[in-house]
């Protein structure tokens, strides 16, 4: 950012003219006491952007701060901001006006404070004296601040001339607090209990000795009030607490239950909410969604994890093929269902090195004596596919067949491609695909078997070659979801007397 | 304390062309702040040029390719071009001119601008 005038102090002529300017790389903006003062905005054609504040008719309350800032400092890199300080001598103002809250100085430790008495002009001498005192007090003054020293509890005021005459300030109150803090907690037995049932409450405050509890809740709102119980915590010092204890809760008994504490000697004080629910009756519900087909993949981990929220806590079982099942000492299975929060679970189900025989309709049910749900799916296994024999043959037709047979779950594609270069194929050359309807000199016949007891599929595909005149290197690919497999074969001519 | 006096202006058709100077009693030289503002009847006084340290000038939207300002250091001389003037450019126009170690800033007395068919 750059200011024109630089600044960081001006004194300007009351009545008069004054423009602050300020450039940056983004939109910038002028700000006082917080506002943003009417401003001419601009871009110029080397993309800088400026922002213009043009004070006309100075006086002596135009004396302060002025900030240059970034419109949006969201998007950069430093939150900049250059600081003008501004005098305008105006012997018709004394000191600045304050704002009642800064009349009034409260303190909770010995620490260094500012009495906040400014004057429009920077040649002006300024004294501070305890408002029942005509001695001045030897603390340093800052024309653009005020007094900074360690006061006591005192009334303090400022005074200075102005050409002959004598000017007060407001009076400052210097109050010094002995405080200690409060820090509050709430915690319920339950967050969530069915009509009936009870609901306990505690709220605790630490280092306090004489505190004044009030609770409010939705029974007190109809006027029926229940006493809360305040014991010490023994065993740890200024330990106080308060039980608030409601029997056979009812459904008007949901809603926000709040602790509000006073510490008497200072009248400070904290409070803090909880929020119950009362129910009818418990539930179960599913949150998320789990697909009705899932998938595991041969020899690898799988876990099946379901979301759920209940009350009262459930008991959750796992089925497969509607058989229960539970942690197996071979360690090929392993059940678990933990309690993330008061009413959310997570119920896993872990395959160890998924086998086929794993695949099959699993189902987890979870229930109480209120409510009970239910979620079922259906798991595949995926086995990578493997190329389990590529043979050629030279039937009596005079063709050459190459047969390829593989398996693979879910169902492999079979790619067929050969290369007529042997020394530039495939390292240099791609290799040609086989088995298009337009290519003459192939055909192609596959057929597709389903293995229910290995789950998986068989894929049988015959490549017929009508003619080869030269050595030709088949390649037979099966593909699926899971991976892939490649074998090869050297398909010699007829005539030629050997094959490699 | 420098002074200012505007000239150049007059009534003008609209589509027509002026150049405003604005001339100061002494050296310009310590001026890093220069603007042209207008004020139209009835309405506040609006900045339409500056230019911060001699650097580029910048324009309003409103009069961004129409109008130019520049400088001569050696007349101590303001000048403000003012090309393709429409109705609403109707005002009395004023320079102003400022320096970082000055107390105030300086306007001229202000220059009218009429542009009518």
């Known amino acids: 950012l750059v200011v024109t005038p630089p600044g960081p102090e001006l004194v300007l002529n009351v009545s008069s003219t004054f423009v602050l300017t300020c450039s940056g790389s983004a939109p910038v903006v002028w700000e006082r006491m917080s506002q943003e003062p009417p401003q001419e905005m601009a871009k110029a054609q080397d993309g800088t952007f400026s922002s213009v504040l043009t004070l006309t008719n100075l006086t002596g309350l135009d004396t302060g701060e002025y900030f240059c800032t970034h419109n949006d400092s969201r998007g950069l890199e430093t939150d900049e901001r250059k600081r003008l300080y501004i005098f305008v001598p105006d012997p018709t103002v004394g000191f600045l006006p304050n704002d009642a809250e800064e009349l009034f100085i409260f303190l909770t430790e010995i620490t260094e404070i500012t009495i906040p008495c400014r004057v429009t002009d920077p040649q002006l001498v300024v004294t501070l004296h305890e408002k029942k005192g005509d001695v001045a007090l030897p603390v340093p003054y800052d024309h653009q601040r005020g007094f900074s020293g360690i006061f006591e509890d005192r009334s303090y005021i400022c005074k200075t001339t102005i050409g002959d005459r004598e000017v007060d300030s407001d009076a400052y109150y210097v109050y010094r607090l002995q405080v200690s803090s409060i820090n509050v907690s709430v915690n319920a037995v339950q967050t969530v209990v069915r009509q009936g049932e009870n609901i306990t409450l505690m709220c605790i405050v630490i280092g306090n000795e004489v505190v004044n509890f009030e609770w409010t809740y939705p029974r007190k709102e109809s006027g029926r009030l229940v006493e809360p119980v305040t014991d010490f915590l023994l065993d740890m010092p200024y330990h106080i607490r308060s039980i608030l204890h409601i029997p056979s809760a009812e459904l008007e008994d949901s809603g926000t239950y709040t602790c509000n504490v006073t510490e008497s000697v200072n009248d400070h004080q904290d409070e803090k909410a909880i929020n119950i629910t009362v129910v009818e009756s418990g539930y179960v519900r599913l949150l998320g969604e789990v697909g009705t087909l899932q998938f595991a993949e041969l020899h690898r981990s799988r876990t099946l994890q379901v979301v759920f929220e209940a009350y009262p806590p459930p008991t959750v079982l796992w089925f497969k093929d509607n058989r229960t099942l539970g942690d197996s000492s071979a360690g090929e299975i392993a059940l678990s269902t933990r309690n993330v929060s008061e009413t959310r679970y997570v119920s896993e189900l872990t395959l160890v090195r998924v086998k086929v025989a794993e695949a099959g309709h699993y189902t987890m049910r979870a229930f109480h004596e209120d409510a009970e749900v239910q979620l079922s799916f259906q798991l595949q296994i995926n086995v990578p596919v493997r190329v389990l024999e590529l043979s050629e043959s030279h039937p009596d037709s005079g063709e050459q067949t190459v047969r390829c047979r593989g398996r693979g779950m879910p169902q492999p594609n079979i790619i067929w491609s050969a290369c007529r270069d042997l020394k530039r194929c495939p390292r240099e050359l791609p290799p040609t695909l086989l088995g298009n309807s337009s290519e003459e000199e192939s055909q192609l016949e596959t057929n597709v078997t389903y293995w229910e007891e290995e789950q998986e599929f068989e894929v049988v595909s015959t490549l017929r070659l009508q003619h080869v005149d030269r050595p030709l290197s088949v390649r037979c690919t099966l593909r699926n979801a899971v991976g892939q497999d490649t074998q090869e074969v050297i398909v010699v001519p007829h005539s030629l007397p050997f094959k490699v | 304390e420098v002074q200012l006096v505007e000239s150049g202006g007059g009534l003008v058709q609209p589509g027509g062309s002026l150049r405003l100077s604005c001339a100061a009693s002494?050296?310009?030289?310590?001026?890093?702040?220069m603007a042209w503002y207008r004020q139209a009847p009835g309405k506040q006084r609006e900045l339409v040029a500056f230019?911060?340290?001699?650097?580029?000038?910048n324009y309003v939207d409103s009069v961004r390719g129409r109008f130019t300002a520049s400088r001569d250091n050696a007349e101590n001389t303001l000048y403000l071009q003012m090309n393709s003037l429409k109705p609403e450019d109707t005002a009395v126009y004023y320079c102003?001119?400022?320096?970082?170690?000055?107390?105030?800033?300086?306007w001229g007395q202000g220059t009218q601008v009429t542009v009518s068919s």
């Open positions: 102003y001119a400022q320096g970082n170690t000055w107390a105030a800033g300086v």
């Open positions: 002494e050296s310009i030289f310590s001026i890093n702040y």
């Open positions: 230019s911060i340290d001699g650097s580029s000038t």
